[in-house]
Interface confidence: low
């Protein structure tokens, strides 16, 4: 339904508060280096303009597209050239090329200072003094650091952030109330950002078909009682929502997400029995709840898949008539029967089925040719099962920190060209699969673990894409979305790698390490471990363990010393010498 003024339409649908918040997110995700005050000024100007269009949709410029209006506004920033360099060239282009240009310049790893949390009293004072600015600052800081964060979900995070301050700033022990809530929001936010980044990568790098296949599999697992036609409708709508958000169309995205939540709740009887509680919540909570809802129970006595997809004489006829619909049905039927499989495994099975039909439906005896197709699934299913079993045993044996270290060594040996901060970040996140998934029973381990690993490996892929240094990473990231994890798992030690020159500075530590949190201290040690492996890729795990144990003892000793700095200087030299000797550097 066409509207005279798109900006007026969205303002009325979303309301002023959400409109302003979403425009701020959009601008901060595009111009990640701009100061907060500049963005607030731009948002206020856009909001005032939108109000004139609500009053009179025929007013000047109200008929322009949102991309045109927003792009024109962004291009008024005076410091565009000196702050963003070649991104300023986007402003010479016309829509839709201009928006595409802005999208291409989004930076997954912007050069921004780490967010330091102020004292609780300072935060509470700021919250009370100017609640609106305080919450806008939260949206701005998250959006500029996470340029693909799912905007309507960020509104939900902001609502929880506000609730935490409202409650805790009145509490007797403000810190005890607030800090755990902020930690939880931070961790959930990072996870949410990474999950959304995979959806956008899927759409942008592998296309709508790849995303739709993912959505069919996931929604069929979640809503196994829903008919195929119902799942297909939800997939189409969900694809539109995510295409919009990944494309920077945040107002349309938020509006369409609200419509989708409304539709799901109005039709929950034909979708899932698990939606009742979600549908009683306010909009932002409702949408979040639906996105996280547990899988419904599988319908009783589902017939064997073989009848329709192997034994039937009409397989090739049905396939030829509508390939993607037939494959979609296969994926739907397989996924609703297998909540115990990861989505990526289900997609590998569907791909194997498609490849078999492509080959067999052109053969002399198609049925004879594809009769054993399900036998080809067995090794595909067993590979992730075995890998997860092994790694969960290893995790249970080692604990999270040492498990992360084992992965750090493993991945540094596979792709030693990748930057040390990226290897540390990615390996730490890969290692979290243990505490996240190994506690689950067998039936939930694979969907938890392998789909989480897909999210983490996508972080590696997007960070590597910015500055490519390894052909092996590029190959695993670009060849197949669903085979990324098996591709990385299969990588052996990179024998072509020339060890890094030894640099004592890399292993020089100071007294400031003593005041770091346990997490930060771990990161320091893990950074040193990666550097050790880069210097000595053939070092055995025993050698590395010995050096790391010595390092831990050195830090502990010097942090207890009276003259810490002298201890770090003198003992540090001895440690470097001993490590060089131990590793034969």
């Amino acid at each position: 339904d066409a509207h005279k003024s798109e900006v007026a339409h969205r303002f009325k649908d979303l309301g002023e508060e959400n409109f302003k918040a979403l425009v701020l997110i959009a601008f901060a995700q595009y111009l990640q280096q701009c100061p907060f005050e500049d963005h607030v000024k731009l948002v206020n100007e856009v909001t005032e303009f939108a109000k004139t269009c609500v009053a009179d949709e025929s007013a000047e410029n109200c008929d322009k597209s949102l991309h045109t209006l927003f792009g024109d506004k962004l291009c008024t920033v005076a410091t565009l050239r000196e702050t963003y360099g070649e991104m300023a060239d986007c402003c010479a282009k016309q829509e839709p090329e201009r928006n595409e240009c802005f999208l291409q310049h989004k930076d997954d790893n912007p050069n921004l200072p780490r967010l330091v949390r102020p004292e609780v009293d300072v935060m509470c004072t700021a919250f009370h003094d100017n609640e609106e600015t305080f919450l806008k600052k939260y949206l701005y800081e998250i959006a500029r650091r996470h340029p693909y964060f799912y905007a309507p979900e960020l509104l939900f995070f902001a609502k929880r952030y506000k609730a935490a301050f409202t409650e805790c700033c009145q509490a007797a022990d403000k810190a005890a109330c607030l800090l755990p809530k902020l930690d939880e929001l931070r961790d959930e936010g990072k996870a949410s950002s990474a999950k959304q980044r995979l959806k956008c990568a899927s759409l942008q790098k592998f296309g709508e078909r790849a995303f739709k296949a993912w959505a069919v599999a996931r929604l069929s697992q979640r809503f196994p009682k829903a008919e195929f036609a119902e799942v297909s409708k939800l997939v189409t709508d969900l694809t539109k929502v995510h295409t919009e958000c990944c494309h920077g169309d945040l107002l349309e995205c938020a509006d369409d997400r609200a419509d989708l939540a409304k539709y799901i709740c109005e039709n929950q009887d034909s979708i899932s029995s698990k939606l009742k509680e979600c549908c009683e919540k306010p909009l932002l909570e409702k949408s979040h709840c639906i996105a996280e809802v547990e899988n419904d129970e599988m319908p009783a006595d589902l017939p064997s898949l073989a009848a329709d997809f192997v034994e039937s004489k009409d397989v090739c006829k049905n396939y030829a008539e509508a390939k993607d619909v037939f494959l979609g049905m296969f994926l739907y039927e397989y996924a609703r029967r297998h909540p115990d499989y990861s989505v990526v495994l289900l997609l590998r099975l569907a791909k194997t089925y498609e490849t078999t039909l492509e080959k067999c439906c052109a053969a002399a005896d198609p049925h004879e040719c594809y009769a054993k197709v399900f036998d080809e699934f067995k090794p595909l299913v067993e590979e992730p099962q075995n890998l997860i079993k092994q790694n969960c045993e290893l995790f249970e044996q080692l604990g999270e920190y040492k498990f992360q270290n084992a992965l750090l060594v493993r991945y540094t040996k596979k792709v030693p060209q990748v930057s040390t901060p990226t290897l540390v970040e990615v390996s730490r996140n890969l290692g979290k699969v243990g505490s996240k998934c190994c506690k689950h029973p067998e039936a939930k381990r694979m969907p938890c673990a392998e789909d989480y690993l897909s999210v983490v490996l996508n972080q590696l892929c997007v960070l590597h894409e910015k500055t490519p240094v390894s052909d092996r990473v590029t190959k695993c990231c670009t060849e197949s979305l669903v085979n990324r994890r098996p591709c990385f798992s299969a990588l052996e030690v990179d024998e072509t790698y020339v060890p890094k020159e030894f640099n004592a500075e890399t292993f020089t530590f100071h007294a400031d390490i003593c005041t770091l949190s346990e997490k930060e201290r771990q990161i320091k040690k893990q950074t040193a471990l990666v550097e050790l492996v880069k210097h000595k890729p053939k070092a055995t795990k025993e050698q590395l363990k010995a050096v790391m144990d010595d390092f831990a003892a050195f830090v502990e000793k010097c942090c207890k010393a009276d003259d810490k700095e002298t201890c770090f200087a003198e003992e540090g030299k001895k440690l470097v010498a001993a490590s060089q000797a131990a590793l034969g550097l």
Partner: nanobody
Amino acid sequence: QVQLQESGGGLVQPGGSLRLSCAASGFTLDYYAIGWFRQAPGKEREGVSCIASSGGSTNYADYVKGRFTISRDNAKNTVYLLMNKLKPEDTAVYYCAAAVLECRTVVREYDYWGQGTQVTVSS
């Protein structure tokens, strides 16, 4: 429950052979290096042989080199020690032990231990 169980010990004449087995239950051996150790009465426990998790790396104590062979069958979740040309000084209780990924030089770094199997070499 995680367990290692040795078997295959017994009485054998000097110059004879035995094959010891170390079977794991409650976990898979794929990610573990397995070491064989022995302890004669009144003596310290000593390393005999070890095989890394990949199976690609094996090592032997000088006193058994050329006579003993270590191997693994991950499908059966078992590691073997084939002992040829046995000598009376090989008499001891033989233990297997598991460590994550790599063989270790220090006995205490092994995570799981079996109960042991007696080997007696005597005429």
